[in-house]
Interface confidence: low
């Protein structure tokens, strides 16, 4: 039975040209995290494998940095980076947990972080 929940940074905004940290946290389960995939609308950004460490997809190497922790740092943001991001936790023996973050990249300086929320 999957008892865990994923807490994410929720809906966030950031300024064009800046950077943002995408973070998810898996709680309420004793399952072992074997791998975390980060993706943007069906496109793989990065993998953090528990044994092998980080792998950043070649097309994102210049703008994506691993961490902190199992999070992901996006740099040199453009308006095209606006959209949904997913953290996909592969766990044993529970299976797969998915968290969603919506990032809005703004032209002006009115960017603010949204509230944190949970996905069961």
């Amino acid at each position: 039975m999957m008892t865990g929940t994923i807490e994410t940074t929720g809906n966030i905004s950031a300024e064009k040209g800046g950077s943002i940290i995408l973070q998810c946290h898996l709680s309420s389960t004793t399952a072992q995290v074997t791998q975390v995939n980060w993706e943007q609308q069906d496109q793989l950004l990065a993998i953090c494998n528990a044994d092998l460490g980080w792998h950043i997809s070649p097309s994102f190497k210049d703008r994506v940095a691993p961490g902190p922790g199992l999070g992901l740092t996006l740099q040199s943001l453009t308006v095209n980076d606006t959209g949904e991001y997913f953290c996909i936790y592969h766990t044993y023996p529970d299976g797969t947990y998915t968290g969603r973050i919506f990032l809005e990249v703004l032209e002006s300086s009115v960017a603010e972080h949204g509230a944190r929320f949970q996905i069961p």
Partner: antibody
């Protein structure tokens, strides 16, 4: 040109061990993970595990954990896969295959047939 | 583990035919699917990754499509060298698993 060359066929008795080698050439050995995949006669493919040649960390398929050991020798650009406590159902062709950032397998070795028979 | 169900397990076709092979994962794998071709006595060869991206040197008659829990590999006009066994594989989360294979035979 990326190339993986594996050691020759082996015949082993049940309970024995086998060690298969995979020598890489045509690229920097530490740039690609090295996977091991097996294929029993007439069957599909089964992923055994993967080693990162750079820092030596390993991820195993739970099914093989405790029976398989993966190592590498950076000086000779060679990866090794040792399988212990062999049984007849381990008879298969064992392949090494590498991958970079994502987990599909770009380049494969020619395969090593391991026959387990009493 | 994610189970990969391939269909059909075998098919007979003629040169010039359009051939479609289906792969159904047991759970959503987004677009993390690869297809391989294997000829008797040879190692598998990567054809498609990320569900629809053709690997280097693969002829354009091969195409992949689908996402989530249903994927297809299509050969638009079967050539003599395409008679082989085809496998799907998810590249989503370890352990990476393969479908049972589809053998494409000459009619």
């Amino acid at each position: 040109q990326l190339q993986l060359v594996q050691s020759g066929a082996e015949v082993k008795k049940p309970g024995a061990s086998v060690k298969v080698s995979c020598k890489a050439s045509g690229y920097s050995f530490t740039d690609y993970n090295m996977n091991w995949v097996r294929q029993a006669p007439g069957q599909s493919l089964e992923w055994i595990g993967v080693i990162n040649p750079n820092h030596g960390t390993i991820s195993y398929n739970q099914k093989f954990k405790g029976r398989v050991t993966m190592t590498r020798d950076q000086s000779t650009s060679t990866a090794y896969m040792e399988l212990n406590s062999l049984r007849s159902e381990d008879t298969a062709v064992y392949y090494c295959a590498n991958n970079w950032d994502v987990w599909y397998f770009d380049v494969w070795g020619q395969g090593t047939l391991v026959t387990v028979s009493s | 583990d994610i189970q990969m169900t391939q269909s059909p397990s075998s098919l007979s076709a003629s040169v010039g035919d359009r051939v479609t092979i289906t792969c159904r994962p047991s759970e959503n794998i987004y677009s993390y699917l690869a297809w391989y071709q294997q000829k008797p006595g040879n190692s598998p060869k990567l054809l498609v990754y990320n569900a629809k991206a053709l690997a280097e040197g693969v002829p354009s008659r091969f195409s992949g499509s689908g996402s989530g829990t249903q994927f297809t590999l299509t050969i638009s006009s079967l050539q003599p060298e395409d008679f082989a066994t085809y496998y799907c594989q998810h590249h989503f989360g370890a352990p990476w698993t393969f479908g049972g294979g589809t053998k494409v035979e000459i009619k």
